[in-house]
């Protein structure tokens, strides 16, 4: 029986470890600056890194600019978006800016898109200063179903800071759905 | 066999509980305002509380102004940094400020420092208002190895809000590395 | 013995699953805009949704405008608060605003209230622009005891953005207390 108990313990340790890792999908995606759209209107950002530098993904999928949920659960979602302008980049079309981020969820089964989180600020970036910067951070806890997709929309994408420490979003599973 | 099963269950419950606690390092460090550097340039903040008020630490180490990882894993890192100025504190050398935070990771084995997250804003804190305030929040999910160190750099440290609810940073382990 | 082992495994899987779910309280509460107080002074926000749209709660209680902890543990707390003003809403009493959030903890046993996190900014919302917007995000990791209550205070509540993606707060349990 002792040997049997050891076997039970051993198999359980493996199972517990394995199931724990399998049960915890995550992603941290950083902006791919080689393909940032221009313009000042709200656009969906589709180019993100998932496997270089700080970017990583496990048990989720990145496809067509969207983070796809592979496993039902409650997830903590977050985004950090930095905007910046230097006078050497040229004159702004307007000094009154609306710098915004929208974290949206799309369900394939019911083709619909909903905003989970938004953040940002109106800014007056006057010519009196040669450099301007502003960051937004949002985060929240959401129920996500397999197949649902998370995407990021921003205003004024041409002002995005392309650094991996500046503009990113991510998710990690916290618990199963009852 | 039933007694044996109860023993297995009991030992497993202990093991599961114990391993769960051991597997979840965390820290929440609050600013130690008795030792904030002056100056307007970017500096590393080295004085933080780890055991008073809201500050706490478990299975991580705080040493030489850095939060040291003791256990490999994926962690959620966060920082909240508040800046403030009241006219009674004196005149600002410039009304055009760059209020920034940088959350950095240093690896001892490969002596190098990298910024994981940054946030902030350029601000114009004019003399027309007697009080100014601004807060930054950043957060993200990162793979950390034992021995790696997390530190906080800010610009204009003399403007930091010294309250424990205002200026703090932290981390908690979410999952093991596969 | 194999059948016994299978029974052990099976019961353990149930127990592990059940205990894991029971051990992970959470809440995501969104602003109830039908009952936002007026004024510019700091007020406690008492009207939140807990069961519609993105709002949800499990193993925590929402009562009298406060989020009540039912289970000791370490929790990650967060809040996202959006303020906005459009000229069609009327003139602001002052263009110099202090837009702030305070996440507070109240202990019933020792009747006292303490601020866990604060964030915000002073803003100059001039009449030169027809629309103004600003969002605050705060988050942190805190030890909470059963019976303790979390509440949200803001300045200028009449400027709150009433959308569920804009103004919300929440919590999820990360680990037990040792």
């Amino acid at each position: 029986i002792r040997a049997e108990k050891a076997m039970v313990d051993g198999s359980w340790l493996d199972l517990a470890k394995r199931s724990k890792l399998e049960a915890q999908p995550f992603a941290h995606l950083t902006i791919n600056a080689t393909d940032i759209p221009s313009g000042s209107h709200k656009v969906s950002l589709s180019s993100w890194y998932h496997d270089r530098g700080w970017a990583k993904i496990s048990n989720m999928t990145f496809s067509n600019g969207k983070l796809i949920v592979n496993q039902d659960g409650f997830y903590y979602l977050y985004a950090n978006i930095c905007f910046r302008h230097h006078e050497t980049s040229g004159d702004l079309a307007t000094e009154y800016l609306q710098l915004m981020v929208y974290v949206t969820k799309t369900s394939i089964k019911i083709p619909s898109s909903h905003t989970l989180m938004k953040g940002g600020s109106t800014k007056y970036w006057s010519g009196n200063s040669e450099f301007h910067f502003y960051s937004i951070n949002v985060g929240g806890f959401f129920k996500l179903r397999s197949g649902e997709e998370i995407s990021i929309e921003v205003s004024n994408p041409s002002l995005l800071d392309p650094d991996q420490d500046a503009t990113y979003f991510g998710a990690f599973k916290v618990r199963d759905i009852d | 066999i039933r007694a044996e099963k109860a023993m297995v269950d009991g030992s497993w419950l202990d093991l599961a509980k114990r391993s769960k606690l051991e597997a979840q390092p965390f820290a929440h460090l609050t600013i130690n305002a008795t030792d904030i550097p002056s100056g307007s340039h970017k500096v590393s903040l080295s004085s933080w509380y780890h055991d008073r008020g809201w500050a706490k630490i478990s299975n991580m180490t705080f040493s030489n102004g850095k939060l040291i990882v003791n256990q490999d894993g994926f962690y959620y890192l966060y920082a909240n940094i508040c800046f403030r100025h009241h006219e009674t504190s004196g005149d600002l050398a410039t009304e055009y400020l760059q209020l920034m935070v940088y959350v950095t990771k240093t690896s001892i084995k490969i002596p190098s420092s990298h910024t994981l997250m940054k946030g902030g804003s350029t601000k114009y804190w004019s003399g027309n208002s007697e009080f100014h305030f601004y807060s930054i929040n950043v957060g993200g999910f990162f793979k950390l190895r034992s021995g790696e160190e997390i530190s906080i750099e800010v610009s204009n440290p003399s403007l930091l809000d010294p309250d424990q609810d205002a200026t703090y940073f932290g981390a908690f382990k979410v999952r093991d590395i596969d | 013995i194999r059948a016994e082992k299978a029974m052990v495994d099976g019961s353990w899987l149930d127990l592990a699953k059940r205990s894991k779910l029971e051990a992970q309280p959470f809440a995501h509460l969104t602003i109830n805009a039908t009952d936002i107080p007026s004024g510019s002074h700091k007020v406690s926000l008492s009207s939140w949704y807990h069961d519609r749209g993105w709002a949800k709660i499990s193993n925590m209680t929402f009562s009298n405008g406060k989020l009540i902890v039912n289970q000791d543990g370490f929790y990650y707390l967060y809040a996202n608060i959006c303020f906005r003003h459009h000229e069609t809403s009327g003139d602001l009493a002052t263009e110099y605003l202090q837009l702030m959030v305070y996440v507070t903890k109240t202990s019933i046993k020792i009747p006292s209230s303490h601020t866990l996190m604060k964030g915000g900014s002073t803003k100059y919302w001039s009449g030169n622009s027809e629309f103004h917007f600003y969002s605050i995000n705060v988050g942190g990791f805190f030890k909470l005891r059963s019976g303790e209550e979390i509440s949200i205070e803001v300045s200028n509540p009449s400027l709150l953005d009433p959308d569920q993606d804009a103004t919300y707060f929440g919590a999820f349990k990360v680990r037990d207390i040792d």
Partner: nanobody, 127 residues
Amino acid sequence: EVQLVESGGGLVQPGGSLRLSCAASGRTFSRSAMGWFRQAPGKGREFVSFITGSGGTTYYGESVKGRFTISRDNAQNPVYLQMNSLRPEDTAVYYCGVYRRTYISSTYSESSEYDYWGQGTLVTVSS
């Protein structure tokens, strides 16, 4: 790497005028508080003038008050030092530096409070 570049120096007769310029590159210092100092041969670095980021506050060394004026463009770079009624004792290498403090302290006239010095520009006042 941060660089400050001073220019505008030269040879001028007593009573004449010069306008020095200090431009920053490599990082956004356009709105930092700045200071001018000078160093005559065989002497220490002497405070000349200070200006805040907005240009709203200025200070001068006793020896140049009423003759020198520090200014900055409404928009950014550079910082200027207009020198009138020049005297032979104004002969020196003139340097600009970035004030390192967030608040204006009583030590604004000390060179140790400044960073990122340029190479300097030589002003010679002689007939």
